[in-house]
Each structure stands twice: as C-alpha cells, then as structure tokens.
C-alpha cells in the first residue's frame, strides 16, 4: 500500500486512509502505538482502504504502520506519524452566584496539562482571560456586573496544544430590565419559557404590550407578529384590523402594523420566518426588518437573507402595505382583493402569509413562493422578530 | 454610471472550452444576482443561467446544464462563464446582465455582448 | 418550463399609430412579466417590469397591463426611434424565459 494519511483527529480518534496496494491483496495488517501506550494490532479485509482507530490517549503522538499479506506474502511498511488532540476539561459549572461573584468549577482532562485558559465574557462584550494552574479545578470570579448574563469558557493547555472550549452560562442576580421592550429583554431578564409576556415600548411602563414570546428557535427571545395554523382566524381584514392587529395571541393572529412600527423604530431588528408542513421545515431570516409609520403606509425594509426557505421576501421590500380597502401596491389590480388578504404587495406576491388558510389555488392561499410555490397553502406560519445584535447573545438564556 | 463589459468571446471548436468575463462597476455588485443571456445569430433571447448576489445559489438552462458553470468573485466586480463541450448551437452573442434590486430575475442593466462562434 | 407566446410576429406601423402587442404564458404568473426593446446591433433595454411599471427613464408613450397569463405593451404614438424589436420575458420561475419577438418596422 502507499499514501498512508489520517484524517478526523479527535482527542481520542483518528481514521486512518491508504492507497491499495497495486496487486490484489488478502489482508491488511495495522499496528499503532505511542508513548506509554502499548501496541495495537489490527487486522483488516485486503479490499479495505480506511480503519478507525479508536480509545486512543488525548495529546500522544502515535505512530501508525502498516504493510500488505497475501498468503505468506508481506509487502514492505509504511509509516505515518500523528498526534491526538488534547482533551477538554469536563463539567464546567458556575455556583455561588451571587450580585458580582460566581464559582466556576470543573473537572480535569485525561491528559496531562500545564494549565487552564479561563475566558468569562459579559453580554456588554467584556471580556476577561485568566490563565491558571495545572492543579486547579476552581476559580473564583469577582467584580462582576449584577444583573448580567455571562459565557465563561476554559480551555486545557499543554505547551503548544489547546483542547476544545467548553462552556457554561450564568446570570447574576438582579433584574436587567424592569420594563422589557422586547422579548429578547424578556429573555435577559431570566424568562426563558415561550409563551405571552407584556413588554413596553420604549422601555415606558404607560406603553404596556401583551406579546408572544417564542424563547426557543434560534436562541429565542423573538416577538412574534404572525401566526397561521388552523385557519380558525378571519386575515381578509380592512386596514384599520391590519393597523391595530387582531386574533388571539396564543393562536392565530395579527400583531398590528403599528406595534410594529413602534417596535422595530426602538432599535435594529431581524426577522425570522418559520413555516411547517407535513412534517418538513424551512425558515428565513432577514438582519434588518422594519416598518414605516402610517404615513409611508407602513413600508417595509428587509434585507440580508439567509435561512432554507428560500428569499421570497426580497420581492416586497420597500413596498407599502395593502389591503383590500387600501390600495398601495404596483399592480393594476388591488392584490388584496384579487388574493384575498393582506401583505406588502407588488405586483402581486411571492410571500402570501396572510392569504387564506388552505386554499390551493395560485396564489390565494399561505404561500411561501420560493418554498411551496403557489400552489400549496403552507400549515404552519410564524413571522417574528427581535434585535439584530441578539446572535451575539446567543444560548446566554442557559442556566449554569 | 453602471455598465458591464463582457470579454472573452471569440472561434472555438466543438467540444473545446471558452471562459466568459463580465467587469461591473457603477453599482454595489455583491446586492445584485447577475445572469447570461444569449441571442443566436437572427433569432430570440433566451436566459442561460444566474447566480445570486452571494454567489451561494446557481441556475442553469437545461440545454448547458453539466456543461456550463457560472461564478463570480465579488472582490473583483466579475462575473464568469466557463464554457465546457462546446456545441454547434452554442454559437450566439453571450450577454451579461444585471438582476433587479429585489426580483433578480429581472434583468434592468445589460452589457454590450461577446460573440462566441462554435465552429470546426 | 413556462412558455411565453408572443404576436404578431411582425407589425409594419406607420409614425404616430398606436401599437399594442400581446404576451401569453402558458402558465399562471400572476404580474412577473417583463419587456425589453432590441434595437439592431444592440443590447436589449429594459422597458416595463412587473406588467405594468415603467422603467426609470422610459417614455411615458410606453404602457404595460395585464396579469395571470394574457399581458399588453402598448406604444400609445409610435415614434421614429420605437422601431425595434419587442420581447416578454417571464420573471416568476426559472428558468426564465422570453417571448420569440415581435418587430416593429415602418410600415
């Protein structure tokens, strides 16, 4: 055989590839040891070109051989050298949180280690190192911001190698924001279970709004302004139901295009679709999602696509919101009315997430063009939205 | 102003290769999903393939589908087709063109054209 | 893929006449339908998009209708730079495809 690599290396694994010997072989035989480890030998099929090598010691160089037999036969050795990576430390843990201290504790990794590299980052973006001792299995962190959520990492070191980070989160105590003006907020206050929570506009007590929450997909901490899923709700509405919104918030509904004008002017915001149909999912998000005042008829601004839904929503960015009574979209005919809802019309759709619950001729129904195209009412729909910064904070609702 | 100039056109034989450009400027070109349309000698427009302003998705016409791959490298403001067993009827004027802001397969902004002739 | 039909093929018109030349597509596409205007030798410009909206910077002579499969440009006064030739195009599935043209020449 010739070639001989590994791939995959892990702290406790590596694969091991060659190139077959030209001639037909019978069998493979493959040795690996390395420093204090005894010698393995395997033998394998002559039609094999790859072996996992397995139970391997974390931060050893191993060195790899192996030759060809066909019957009593032996092709020459050849031989590759490779070193496993160091293993993590284990079951990292913040206790004793208090205002501004908390103890990190953890286990130490199978390998030797010549110390610990500690980072503990604020939701502000602080960020603290500290490096440790070989020894050490605790640390006590000081001079922590009450009321805040922190990402504490570590690190083994050995010489030159670094294993993986492992991670805890933790909050001090405290409330972050006694007048959430989002779910997001919500969420940072500690609140970490989806459902209906009152937020307030601009931070003001007197601009209370009852929201749904959704703290899960993605990181959460998303308000949700949509949601299709039964049809039991009526979206062939007037503008004045499409301006104040309308349903149930715990079902189907319609947050109001002024909640949503007043939300996404406190700041920069994402959007976040998620639609379902039997059984299979797709999502979108935008990095900036707003909407305009009444007076520009509540325009709207989405850009920055990703997501596995594909981008329907770049046809209507810019456009002015429609309904059947008020007519502002690009079309010769009133899209609203032709459709039978209500969206960000052009001319007409390519988004249709106010049409009529399970309606399967073009166009009329929950459509999601670049996903279902338009002949398929999709089941299931969720417009929602929250900061734009908040993937910085990402899984920082964790307990420690 | 915005403007694109395709290169790169010229006589190949059947079954070689050929490799289109397209310089853009006047415009922010990593918004924008570019395309290439052909036109055959004295007959119609037909679309070829697209790319998305990213360049993460592609799109191709049947007919150079395996054969044809579109790309651009947005540092540079370029668009490429790289040409593969050529045929016969793949003997037009190569446009390249510019997608429209929200509906890129609207094609607002054309350049001046490439000829590319298969032909032994 | 959806094919768009054009016609007439040809349409010899006189200075100052209305044109109307019509686009069919084989499928619904709600308002995804686009014109351009060639003139010989040149690239193709694009005239109307989304049916009905004209492009930046084109004569107000021109006007498109229509939605779902049957679709209209109109020249309301055919002037002597208008001789060209006209194609639909498709914008709402790829591939995207275009009409086989209609010329208009001076009759």
């Known amino acids: 055989p010739s070639g001989l690599v590994t791939a995959n290396i892990t702290d406790s694994e590596a694969l091991a590839r060659w190139q077959p010997a030209i001639a037909t072989v019978d069998s493979y035989v493959i040795s690996y040891t390395g420093e204090k480890v005894p010698e393995i030998t395997r033998t394998v099929s002559g039609n094999t070109v790859e072996y996992a090598l397995t139970d391997l010691e974390p931060a050893t160089e191993y060195t790899l051989r192996i030759f060809a037999e066909k019957g009593p036969q032996k092709s020459s050795t050849i031989t590759a050298k490779f070193t496993t990576d160091l293993d993590s430390p284990r079951d990292l843990t913040a206790t004793e949180v208090q205002s501004e201290t908390a103890l990190l504790t953890w286990r130490p990794p199978r390998a030797s280690v010549t110390g610990y590299l500690l980072v503990y980052e604020s939701v502000d973006g602080t960020v603290k190192e500290v490096i440790v001792g070989p020894d050490t299995t605790s640390y006590s962190l000081a001079d922590l911001s009450p009321s805040t959520h922190y990402t504490a990492k570590i690190q083994a070191l050995n010489g030159p190698l670094r294993s993986n980070m492992i991670q805890t989160i933790f909050t001090t105590i405290g409330l972050l924001y006694p007048f959430p003006k989002d779910c997001s907020q919500a969420m940072l206050n500690g609140d970490t279970t989806s459902g209906l929570y009152t937020i307030y506009l601009n931070g003001d007590k007197a601009e209370a709004l009852e929201v749904f929450c959704d703290m899960t997909s993605d990181g959460g901490g998303w308000i949700v302004f949509l949601r299709r899923k039964n049809g039991r709700e009526n979206f062939y509405q007037n503008w004045k139901a499409y301006a104040a919104g309308f349903g149930d918030r715990r079902e189907e509904f319609w947050l109001g295009l002024d909640n949503l004008n007043k939300i996404t002017a406190q700041g920069q915001y994402e959007l976040r679709v998620d639609l379902r149909d039997h059984g299979e999912t797709a999502f979108a998000v935008y990095d900036k999602f707003s909407v305009g005042d009444a007076k520009t008829r509540y325009k709207l601004k989405v850009e920055g696509y990703s997501g596995t839904a594909g981008d329907s929503m770049a046809y209507h960015n810019g456009r002015s919101f429609s309904t059947f009574d008020k007519d502002t979209d690009s079309a010769i005919t009133n899209c609203a009315l032709s459709y039978k809802g209500a969206f960000w019309y052009r001319n007409c759709h390519r988004v249709n997430l106010m049409g009529r619950y399970g309606d399967n001729n073009h166009s009329q129904g929950v459509n999601w063009f670049h996903w279902k195209g338009h002949e398929h009412s999709i089941q299931f729909a969720e417009m929602k939205l929250r900061p734009s910064n908040f993937r910085n904070l990402e899984g920082r609702r964790k307990r420690a | 102003q915005v403007q694109l100039v395709e290169s790169g056109g010229g006589l190949v034989q059947p079954g070689r290769s050929l490799r289109l450009s397209c310089a853009a400027s006047?415009?922010?070109?990593?918004?924008?999903?570019m395309h290439w349309v052909r036109q055959a000698p004295g007959k119609g427009l037909e679309w070829v393939s697209g790319?998305?302003?990213?360049?993460?998705?592609?799109y191709y016409a049947d007919s150079v589908k395996g054969r044809f791959t579109i790309s651009r490298d947005n540092a540079k403001n370029s668009l490429y087709l790289q040409m593969n067993s050529l045929r016969a009827e793949d003997t037009a004027l190569y446009y390249c063109?510019?997608?429209?802001?929200?509906?890129?397969?609207?094609?607002?902004?054309w350049g001046q054209g490439t000829m590319v002739t298969v032909s032994s | 893929d959806i094919q768009m039909t054009q016609s007439p093929a040809s349409l010899p018109t006189p200075v100052g006449d209305r044109v109307t030349i019509t686009c069919r597509a084989s499928?619904?596409?709600?308002?995804?339908l686009n014109w351009y205007q060639q003139k010989p030798g040149k690239a193709p410009k694009l005239l109307i998009y989304?049916?009905?909206n004209l492009e930046t910077g084109v004569p107000s002579r021109f006007s498109g209708s229509g939605s779902g499969t049957d679709f209209t440009l109109t020249i309301s006064s055919l002037q002597p730079e208008d001789f060209a030739t006209y194609y639909c195009?498709?914008?709402?599935?790829?591939?995207?495809?275009f009409g086989q043209g209609t010329k208009v020449d001076i009759k």
């Open positions: 989304d049916a009905s």
């Open positions: 790319i998305s302003g990213s360049g993460g998705s592609t």
């Open positions: 195009q498709q914008s709402y599935s790829t591939p995207q495809t």
């Open positions: 063109a510019k997608g429209q802001k929200g509906e890129g397969d609207t094609f607002d902004i």
């Open positions: 499928q619904y596409i709600q308002g995804f």
């Open positions: 006047g415009f922010t070109f990593d918004d924008y999903a």
